[in-house]
Amino acid sequence: MAFSGSQAPYLSPAVPFSGTIQGGLQDGLQITVNGTVLSSSGTRFAVNFQTGFSGNDIAFHFNPRFEDGGYVVCNTRQNGSWGPEERKTHMPFQKGMPFDLCFLVQSSDFKVMVNGILFVQYFHRVPFHRVDTISVNGSVQLSYISFQNPRTVPVQPAFSTVPFSQPVCFPPRPRGRRQKPPGVWPANPAPITQTVIHTVQSAPGQMFSTPAIPPMMYPHPAYPMPFITTILGGLYPSKSILLSGTVLPSAQRFHINLCSGNHIAFHLNPRFDENAVVRNTQIDNSWGSEERSLPRKMPFVRGQSFSVWILCEAHCLKVAVDGQHLFEYYHRLRNLPTINRLEVGGDIQLTHVQT
């Protein structure tokens, strides 16, 4: 069962949200829903794994309710009719607080983890492979919905029909209710690996806004900077690294380094003092030749939030900023699995790192 590489995340989707799950649900698929429960309005929210966009066929309805002391309802809807509710009388969510909600699809059940602790298992009532859509509604603001597939032995790349020269995008920041499949880079099957999401919210006073929802304050600590973490299994074709954060108002420079031992295999260095995005490699403390060309204007802006998506392919890294392909960087260090450390430093505040 060789699954393709993971679907690109939906970033800051507006609620209510419906989005396609590319390839449908598969045994071993992990879906992470990251957001904040709104404190002001409503007493419920729901995450639904469903067939199509109508909402008549929901394989798994996960529905926290801030009523009667708080409880969570799990259910299935078939042809518009709800089955018997399964209730969990513990409420792991808090109004006004962020949460990390992970769903693992397995052959017999959905497992649900909330804030790092297994919360509930829900045994399938209908075949899960019918599910092709995730929807979220109710009193919640979303930061992202991400997908992580299981992977097996490498095979020849199954290249997509999208030519590499075309710009490819993250899912758009949704304005409407329904999301069609996003245009993404081709993703290749790869060895089994582990995605690690390192999540903390931005610091006091930092806002993260979307077109459809007013900015919200996140009074939570930022990542310690510089931020250093291991990339489990190193790089390989189809490996993705996702970072988001905010450029400090007085920023001069920041950097994202992918390292192999003492070498910097990939140095991504936005420089506001030079209005440039510099890329380079450092081997044995010696820098190579810089790459600076961009297809459009400098995408990073002082004081503004950003997302960076780095996709490793056989011959190069592809880098997208704010959902738009920006450049390719051909590997100078070609022993990809040894590139196993991410270092981020400089004049930014990180809000999310997924390796």
């Epitope: 607080m97 949460f99 992970c102 790092g116 582990q194 919210q201 931020f227 973490t229």
Partner: antibody, heavy 121, light 109 residues
Framework: EVQLVESGGGLVQPGGSLRLSCAAS????????IHWVRQAPGKGLEWVAY????????SYADSVKGRFTISADTSKNTAYLQMNSLRAEDTAVYYC??????????????WGQGTLVTVSS | DIQMTQSPSSLSASVGDRVTITCRAS??????VAWYQQKPGKAPKLLIY???SLYSGVPSRFSGSRSGTDFTLTISSLQPEDFATYYC???????????FGQGTKVEIK
């Protein structure tokens, strides 16, 4: 190398307070949940509290609820256990432990060496 | 609260013996069970996570299994360094999201 180092234990009178620290290195506490587990002399392990720093989510054992507060300072990469209204039965070695950072892996993979808290008059 | 009832509380065995320790959860905890080894004056060490997965660096003579709400730690051939106390632990969200078993002390016969 991942390491957890507890500090702050000692002798305190009943009704008193102590703050335990758990300094982490080799990983960021923001990417894990951190748990405090205690062990009274000659007894078994008792879970005390946990924090998931990203969502400021925390939970406590019934025996310490309302008296103990767990927190984390991600800039210092340190977790804390503030213990108030201490009782003789709180006497124990207190361990901090990291719950595995890998999703769907259930287990505390790194532990500190422990710090002894003695509540006695 | 979810209770983890561990048995036996102690056992005596010889080097080379096969040793089995069980934990029964008072309700379903899926596979969210770990096993630890603790020696006097030391912190616990993770042996088995997610009910049946061997933690890195742990000898293969240790194994874990699950049958419904019953969880078993097996040491296939007891070694001198295995004399210690063993604990099971569940992490399934309840009023107390983490609970430990009472422990099993494995002593030399």
């Amino acid at each position: 190398e991942v390491q957890l180092v507890e500090s702050g234990g000692g002798l305190v009178q009943p009704g008193g307070s102590l703050r335990l620290s758990c300094a982490a290195s080799g990983f960021t506490v923001s990417s894990s949940s951190i748990h405090w587990v205690r062990q009274a002399p000659g007894k078994g392990l008792e879970w005390v509290a946990y924090i998931y720093p990203y969502s400021s989510s925390s939970s406590y054992a019934d025996s310490v609820k309302g008296r103990f507060t767990i927190s984390a300072d991600t800039s210092k990469n340190t977790a804390y256990l503030q213990m108030n209204s201490l009782r003789a039965e709180d006497t124990a070695v207190y361990y901090c432990a990291r719950y595995s950072t890998y999703k769907w892996v259930w287990g505390m993979d790194y532990w500190g060496q422990g710090t002894l808290v003695t509540v006695s008059s | 609260d979810i209770q983890m009832t561990q048995s036996p509380s102690s056992l005596s065995a010889s080097v080379g013996d096969r040793v089995t320790i069980t934990c029964r959860a008072s309700q379903s905890v899926s596979s969210a069970v770990a096993w630890y080894q603790q020696k006097p004056g030391k912190a616990p060490k993770l042996l088995i996570y997610s009910a049946s997965s061997l933690y890195s660096g742990v000898p293969s003579r240790f194994s874990g299994s699950r049958s419904g709400t019953d969880f078993t730690l097996t040491i296939s051939s007891l070694q001198p360094e295995d004399f210690a106390t063993y604990y099971c632990q569940q992490s399934y969200y309840d009023s107390n999201p983490i609970t430990f078993g009472q422990g099993t002390k494995v002593e030399i016969k």
